[in-house]
């Protein structure tokens, strides 16, 4: 019949429904570089996976243009406040695009998690979750940054993570 | 034409697009058991529903293998801190699989919500949200746990909940 | 062949897969009205977009019946606590439906972000994230409310936002 081309596309699409781009990356010992760069992530071991998205130096890279729900959680914790800590911890998702020289803020949270500077002896924990829909072109990248990253707690990939899926 | 079998599959898939597995379960008076088990949930009344997922003793059960965005929010609150409260409240999503005897941590948050033990007279509120993409095989289950669950506040199903959908 | 009608539907659906309803609205200077109404949102500039959903006076309006993952984040912050502030900040997503005269609570968080009233000199930040799956009929609306909205911080649309997509 005359539907050949479209038919093949539909068959392909049916198969690739299970290939809707998605990823979940997990925190690892190497996530915190101290270099001022974005957090780095585990892409294969344990709960981590990439399906239809690429990874490069901390960034999820879109292979297919469209709208993506992107998310990240970071586990914060400490005993009192480290010296020199600003009153704000900033956790954000940022886009890198060839069309613009600087990273673009997408989703950002600010928190004051560690209480007063005088309570130096107190163990505290806090968590920051971000999620939202953004548009990505092919080759555009999303990264996670935390300032001050000294407060990010990593253990087994369940407490700090980064992911996305096409909507 | 020769596309019969595939055609039926495509028609079926078009119909079942609206049956993409999804669920949203809500907190109820019976959610907190005090038994050390996971939280239990309302599956039918009010905002709660199951579509292509099953429920069993607090667990969402996958009927179809694939990647799911799973999420949970718990409302925490109290007047001061309860006796015996650790400095950490842990809120987590855990997987149960026939392939492994113990629950597997998927997504976890730790928080120190209720301030210092000395502030016994102070009403406080906090909320913990978790969400992320995980792979589930048919029959695998996801549950929510909160330690210490004495701090979870239930009222009308809007403040503490648990859900998932296939991505 | 005899599949004509259905074929057109399938072709249409393949094309409209990219038109799965989705939206992401961002906070703007005009978001906080002080009128007791819901928060208002930017729908076009910057990261904001509407795809298969409408917007009206702060509300996302469903054009297609189904289950939607709806979400909102608000950035809270201040220096101490404003006079008259209740000990609780409530951040919620609410449904408006022609079938019921009052707004229906969907997803709600309560937080005590600004510490004790005596700590008036301290800058603090906190963030509240909500997300969950709800059913919307055509014409039903979802809005975001924050009580007390005086504590919502707006800057560039990345810290306070509101979105949805069909699942």
């Amino acid at each position: 019949d005359g539907h050949g081309g479209s038919w093949e596309q539909l068959i392909q699409e049916r198969r690739s429904h299970q290939n809707n781009p998605a990823a979940h990356l997990t925190g690892a010992n190497s996530s915190l570089t101290g270099s001022g760069g974005p957090l780095l992530w585990e892409t294969q071991l344990g709960l981590a996976f990439l399906r239809g998205l690429d990874y490069h130096d901390g960034a999820l890279v879109a292979n297919k243009a469209g709208y993506y729900y992107i998310y990240s959680k970071v586990q914060l914790g400490g005993v009192g406040c480290p010296l020199g800590l600003a009153s704000t911890i900033t956790h954000g998702l940022y886009k890198r695009t060839p069309r613009y020289p600087e990273e673009l803020e997408l989703l950002v949270s600010q928190q004051s998690p560690c209480g007063r500077a005088t309570s130096n002896s107190r163990v505290w924990w806090d968590s920051s979750f971000l999620g939202g829909v953004v548009h990505l072109e092919v080759g555009e990248e999303v990264v996670v940054r935390v300032l001050d990253e000294r407060l990010v707690r990593l253990r087994d990939g369940t407490r700090s993570y980064f992911g996305a899926f096409m909507v | 034409d020769g596309h019969g079998g595939s055609w039926e599959q495509l028609i079926q898939e078009r119909r079942s697009h609206q049956n993409n597995p999804a669920a949203h379960l809500t907190g109820a008076n019976s959610s907190l058991t005090g038994s050390g088990g996971p939280l239990l949930w309302e599956t039918q009344l009010g905002l709660a529903f199951l579509r292509g997922l099953d429920y069993h003793d607090g667990a969402l059960v996958a009927n179809k293998a694939g990647y799911y965005y799973i999420y949970s929010k718990v409302q925490l609150g109290g007047v001061g801190c309860p006796l015996g409260l650790a400095s950490t409240i842990t809120h987590g999503l855990y997987k149960r699989t026939p392939r492994y005897p113990e629950e597997l941590e998927l997504l976890v948050s730790q928080q120190s919500p209720c301030g210092r033990a000395t502030s016994n007279s102070r009403v406080w509120w906090d909320s913990s949200f978790l969400g992320g993409v995980v792979h589930l095989e048919v029959g695998e289950e996801v549950v929510v746990r909160v330690l210490d669950e004495r701090l979870v506040r239930l009222r009308d199903g809007t403040r503490s909940y648990f859900g998932a959908f296939m991505v | 062949d005899g599949h004509g009608g259905s074929w057109e539907q399938l072709i249409q659906e393949r094309r409209s897969h990219q038109n799965n309803p989705a939206a992401h609205l961002t906070g703007a200077n005009s978001s906080l009205t002080g009128s007791g109404g819901p928060l208002l949102w930017e729908t076009q500039l910057g990261l904001a977009f509407l795809r298969g959903l409408d917007y009206h006076d702060g509300a996302l309006v469903a054009n297609k019946a189904g289950y939607y993952y709806i979400y909102s984040k608000v950035q809270l912050g201040g220096v101490g606590c404003p006079l008259g502030l209740a000990s609780t900040i409530t951040h919620g997503l609410y449904k408006r439906t022609p079938r019921y005269p009052e707004e229906l609570e969907l997803l709600v968080s309560q937080q005590s972000p600004c510490g004790r009233a005596t700590s008036n000199s301290r800058v603090w930040w906190d963030s509240s994230f909500l997300g969950g799956v709800v059913h919307l009929e055509v014409g039903e609306e979802v809005v975001v409310r924050v009580l007390d909205e005086r504590l919502v911080r707006l800057r560039d649309g990345t810290r306070s936002y509101f979105g949805a997509f069909m699942v």
Partner: antibody
Framework: QVQLVQSGAEVKKPGASVKVSCKAS????????VHWVRQAPGQGLEWIGA????????SYNQKFKGRATLTADKSTSTVYMELSSLRSEDTAVYYC??????????????WGQGTLVTVSS | EIVLTQSPATLSVSPGERATLSCKAS??????????MNWYQQKPGQPPRLLIY???NLESGIPARFSGSGSGTEFTLTISSLQSEDFAVYYC?????????FGQGTKLEIK
């Protein structure tokens, strides 16, 4: 069934200390707070404090802080209340009581039979 | 601390009649839709016995003639039809914050 059995009556001199025990049975000892309440002859009820046997955490009425010490022994499911620097106005019946699991509703659903402590020179 | 004031100090009622006991708190004891007020009965030589918890919930094993009501700062214990075994001292207790405090008691006596 839930039972709280207290030690016997005590007579003490002013300035001395007394240690009253409360043995619990019929429930998971480490899951519930145990509170101590006293009642002077012909008077009302006064809360002294509570202990969480799960980890030994304690909370005291400021009035008794420094004089009362609450402890729990998981191996014997027994809670102890020690009151030091006794004075005549400490003469009272001392009760242990189990607190509800859900801490915000700290009602006392089971009580010991009471221990009379008499402080007299 | 939260002060609880019970009234009357003594209440004389005939068997079969209704008894209403009052308890007022110096500040609200409400939290998240619940009122953290409890009621106990005490007979001579016995420990107190829990009747009502969180203002209106009847403890298991307690006869249905006992009921509790109120919110905020004002609470009531009602005994709908007094039986001979109900004559005792009744205490209210707040569990909103520590120190947990009791009212001074209401003595319910036979008229």
């Amino acid at each position: 069934q839930v039972q709280l059995v207290q030690s016997g009556a005590e007579v003490k001199k002013p300035g001395a200390s007394v240690k009253v025990s409360c043995k619990a049975s019929g429930y998971t000892f480490t899951s519930y707070n145990v509170h101590w309440v006293r009642q002077a002859p012909g008077q009302g009820l006064e809360w002294i404090g509570a202990v969480y046997p799960g980890n030994g955490d304690t909370s005291y009425n400021q009035k008794f802080k420094g004089r009362a010490t609450l402890t729990a022994d998981k191996s014997t499911s027994t809670v102890y209340m020690e009151l030091s620097s006794l004075r005549s106005e400490d003469t009272a019946v001392y009760y242990c009581a189990r607190g509800s699991y859900y801490y915000t509703s700290s009602y006392f659903d089971h009580w010991g039979q009471g221990t009379l402590v008499t402080v007299s020179s | 601390e939260i002060v609880l004031t019970q009234s009357p100090a003594t209440l004389s009622v005939s068997p079969g009649e209704r008894a209403t006991l009052s308890c007022k708190a110096s500040q609200s004891v409400d939290f998240d839709g619940d009122s953290y007020m409890n009621w106990y009965q005490q007979k001579p030589g016995q420990p107190p016995r829990l009747l009502i918890y969180t203002a209106s919930n009847l403890e298991s094993g307690i006869p249905a003639r006992f009921s509790g009501s109120g919110s905020g700062t004002e609470f009531t214990l009602t005994i709908s039809s007094l039986q001979s075994e109900d004559f005792a001292v009744y205490y209210c207790q707040q569990s909103y914050e520590d120190p947990f405090t009791f009212g001074q008691g209401t003595k319910l006596e036979i008229k």
